[in-house]
Interface confidence: low
Amino acid sequence: VQNSCDNCQPGTFCRKYNPVCKSCPPSTFSSIGGQPNCNICRVCAGYFRFKKFCSSTHNAECECIEGFHCLGPQCTRCEKDCRPGQELTKQGCKTCSLGTFNDQNGTGVCRPWTNCSLDGRSVLKTGTTEKDVVCGPPVVSFSPSTTISVTPEGGPGGHSLQVL
């Protein structure tokens, strides 16, 4: 004989000894009908705010307040947004590994430093976890007796540098 609790809709609860479908009380929900109890709705407070309010059939969904991001399944905790020099992983904010950087606040991933030598340029300023390498001008390969004319700004009377 089919128990009438089996016919209960989501948003209700039902006890086997009194098989009547009853609506979930306020601040509770039941996504599956026929359960003996409704579940207490999640409250989004503190560093959480409501993404979706609770209904009789669905739990509330939380998200993190400005400047924080979710961690864990169903946003079980809030962690401060990553700062430059870090990237967000499943384990939270992690410092960029050597040779990589992230110059963005709260978002982005660690990217490899620019390889200046691929463009035939020298490293003018070394990179950090927050900043990319600064490449210098292209490296000029001098042949003997090359003359470079250096003209200071604001005047034509230049200097000659003889490279032997």
Partner: antibody, heavy 117, light 107 residues
Framework: EVQLVESGGGLVQPGRSMKLSCAAS????????MAWVCQAPKRGLEWVAT????????YYRDSVKGRFTFSRDNAKSTLYLQMDSLRSEDTATYYC??????????WGQGVMVTVSS | DIRMTQSPVSLSTSLGETVNIECLAS??????LAWYQQKPGKSPQLLIY???TLQNGVPSRFSGSGSGTQYSLKINSLQSEDVATYFC?????????FGAGTKLELK
């Protein structure tokens, strides 16, 4: 209302052990990292340890590493600080605290631990 | 460890005055700074987190500012209930560290 109530303090001899407890109520305990902070007159406030919301990760200050063990029972909304090989410099008031944005947004009333022979 | 140097150590002032307490970090803490108030025989209470965000229920006469290594707590129009010791705390990196405190008294 968020409440944190510590217990288990008292007088203990150097080298012996003591276990502190902290009962939490008024918030969803398993959503929050928790911490112990101590305060001694000459040293001021010192962070002791932090435990992640699910108990999977713990962090300790160097001076207690290997001697103190921080654990939690989310079903009971309770924290524990097992303190072994106690030293005179561990004498302090110990507070359990809820971790907010790295800060400690709620504190218990504190429990005194005196390590002396 | 990041050292937090708080100044002044103590401060004697009058009701209605404006109070400034400074906190200097030994390295950049990227605004990960909190301020606490502690009254005698009581546990500390969070006033401000993330440099300038007021904790719920904290009067608006309290404000925080700063960046990099330098931070400050300002109390406008001092009230008698503000007499306490104030601590700064960095939570940028473990181990989290506190300043030694500033004891605020009335003249």
């Amino acid at each position: 209302e968020v409440q944190l109530v510590e217990s288990g303090g008292g007088l203990v001899q150097p080298g012996r052990s003591m276990k502190l407890s902290c009962a939490a109520s008024g918030f969803t305990f398993n959503n929050y990292d928790m911490a112990w902070v101590c305060q001694a007159p000459k040293r001021g406030l010192e962070w002791v340890a932090t435990i992640s919301y699910d108990g999977s990760t713990t962090y300790y200050r160097d001076s207690v590493k290997g001697r103190f063990t921080f654990s939690r029972d989310n079903a009971k909304s309770t924290l524990y600080l097992q303190m072994d090989s106690l030293r005179s410099e561990d004498t302090a008031t110990y507070y359990c605290a809820r971790v907010g944005a790295g800060d400690f947004d709620y504190w218990g009333q504190g429990v005194m631990v005196t390590v002396s022979s | 460890d990041i050292r937090m140097t708080q100044s002044p150590v103590s401060l004697s002032t009058s009701l209605g005055e404006t109070v400034n307490i400074e906190c200097l970090a030994s390295e950049d803490i990227y605004s990960d700074l909190a301020w606490y108030q502690q009254k005698p025989g009581k546990s500390p209470q969070l006033l401000i987190y993330s440099t300038n965000t007021l904790q719920n229920g904290v009067p608006s006469r309290f404000s925080g500012s700063g960046s990099g290594t330098q931070y400050s707590l300002k109390i406008n129009s001092l009230q008698s209930e503000d007499v306490a010791t104030y601590f700064c705390q960095q939570n940028n990196n473990y181990p989290y560290t506190f300043g030694a405190g500033t004891k605020l008294e009335l003249k």
